[in-house]
């Protein structure tokens, strides 16, 4: 299922870095996140649990990321002009079943005031 | 899995408007392909088999399309700006098992020689 | 087609050692935690332990008491259970499984460990 | 450690008949809206295979005869019209907590 744009704040921008929130339904217990830039991925988060209900967090394209039970966060630092294009969360639901992927994203505008190292 | 820029010429112009190929491995017997423009479905195919071996073609979002072995082509007509976005072939493997999405893209230029309507 | 293949058991004598190999096919076997679980000639299912995707993290039953050891090599798609200092009560069918995100949803056949003088 | 029990230990059938197993755990398996329990068949000589998990959803490729049901500290499984290939062990399997353990089982065998 894609969901298309998301319908809330993707973009949080703070000290010349921007934090891209990837939100996904509480009721996700075990999923994997990516963050893709265009159709590369430049970042991901996968939460499973084991046969005891422990759980494991894993990354294989690390980024500084913050987990809620809602969200992920990734954080993206020393904007530049580059940084601008489509960003999406690729989010893959293991559970509850069945399995299923959502696609959201938003195109991420850079302005002057958002970069890191203005000239002044 | 995200493969990320597709590694073949993705989009062929014709008359004004334009073939968006979005190629699969020949081995996939039953699949969903769908072309999302940013994060948005634009059109769908779904090829699966029954019991008795009958194939079924279906779409939910309609486009013209045409099926290969190994490639859906989706096809624009009157191509104006508006088309100039990131298209992405989002393929939904589901036989041969395992399960696997794979998501390959690029970005469609429009210039103006490929418009439609060109205001001589 | 998910396939799970136990070698490795045989006879060992109280206090030896044994390791149990698992080798996987037909799936992405780094995307899975591993389980061992057991069956005592004429009982019941038993768990072992288990091991988190990468391997960096390993829990186990209280029986095992640090005497048992779970490991993989994902680019082998291998899961192993190193045993020392058997017991007799360890004589059992051990089995290999996938926790398949809810439940056990594919095994190996079994291997079989008997430890006797 | 959940303790799981199950009741009968073993029980006699008959083809078309309806079987019904149940299992307790010793604390409440509920987490959010779901039962983290599992049920298993095995068959003589042969390792076990998964038929329900959640206490309520049937495995991929599972018979519809097979039910699961129960919430809370009591589940059970039904078998709506058993048939002889349905004979062998099953056991319940918690998965709420580390250990994750399983009970006793119950033999269904021919009348």
């Known amino acids: 299922e894609i969901n298309g744009s998301a319908n809330y704040e993707m973009f949080i921008f703070h000290n010349g870095g921007v934090q891209i929130l990837c939100k996904y339904p509480d009721i996700v217990q075990q999923f994997k996140m990516q963050l893709l830039k265009g159709g590369q991925i430049l970042c991901d988060l996968t939460k499973t649990k084991g046969s005891g209900n422990k759980v494991s967090i894993k990354s294989l394209k690390f980024c500084h990321s913050q987990l809620s039970n809602n969200s992920v966060s990734f954080f993206l630092y020393n904007l530049d002009r580059s940084h601008a294009n489509y960003y999406f969360c690729n989010l893959s639901i293991f559970d509850p079943p069945p399995f299923k992927v959502t696609l959201t994203g938003g195109y991420l505008h850079i302005y002057e005031s958002q970069l890191c190292c203005q000239l002044k | 899995e995200i493969n990320g820029s597709a590694n073949y010429e993705m989009f062929i112009f014709h008359n004004g408007g334009v073939q968006i190929l979005c190629k699969y491995p020949d081995i996939v017997q039953q699949f969903k392909m769908q072309l999302l423009k940013g994060g948005q479905i634009l059109c769908d195919l779904t090829k699966t088999k029954g019991s008795g071996n009958k194939v079924s073609i279906k779409s939910l979002k309609f486009c013209h399309s045409q099926l290969s072995n190994n490639s859906v082509s989706f096809f624009l007509y009157n191509l104006d700006r508006s088309h100039a976005n990131y298209y992405f072939c989002n393929l939904s493997i589901f036989d041969p098992p395992p399960f696997k999405v794979t998501l390959t893209g690029g970005y469609l230029h429009i210039y103006e020689s490929q418009l439609c309507c060109q205001l001589k | 087609e998910v396939q799970l293949v136990e070698s490795g058991g045989g006879l060992v004598k109280p206090g030896g050692s044994l390791t149990l190999s698992c080798a996987a096919s037909g799936f992405t076997f780094s995307d899975y935690w591993m389980d061992w679980v057991r069956q005592g000639p004429g009982k019941g299912l038993e768990w072992v332990g288990n091991?988190?995707?990468?391997?960096?993290?390993?829990y186990y039953a209280p029986f095992v008491k640090g005497r048992f050891t779970i490991s993989r090599d994902n680019a082998k798609k291998t899961l192993y259970l190193q045993m020392n200092s058997v017991k007799s009560e360890d004589t059992a069918t051990y089995y290999c499984?996938?926790?398949?995100?809810?439940?056990?949803?594919?095994w190996g056949q079994g291997t079989l460990v008997t430890v006797s003088s | 450690d959940i303790v799981m029990t199950q009741s009968p230990s073993s029980l006699a059938v008959s083809p078309g008949d309806k079987v019904t197993i149940n299992c307790k755990s010793s604390q409440s398996l509920l987490s959010g809206n779901y039962n983290y329990l599992a049920w298993y068949q095995q068959k003589t000589g042969q390792a076990p295979k998964l038929l329900i998990f959640?206490?309520?959803t049937r495995h991929t490729g599972v018979p519809d005869r097979f039910m699961g049901s129960g919430s809370g500290t009591d589940f059970s499984l039904t078998i709506n019209s058993f048939q002889t290939e349905d004979l062998g062990d099953y056991y319940c399997q918690h998965h709420y907590s580390t250990p994750p353990t399983f009970g006793p089982g119950t033999k269904l065998e021919i009348k």
């Open positions: 499984t996938r926790w398949g995100r809810y439940a056990f949803d594919s």
């Open positions: 091991i988190d995707e990468d391997g960096s993290t390993t």
């Open positions: 959640y206490a309520s």
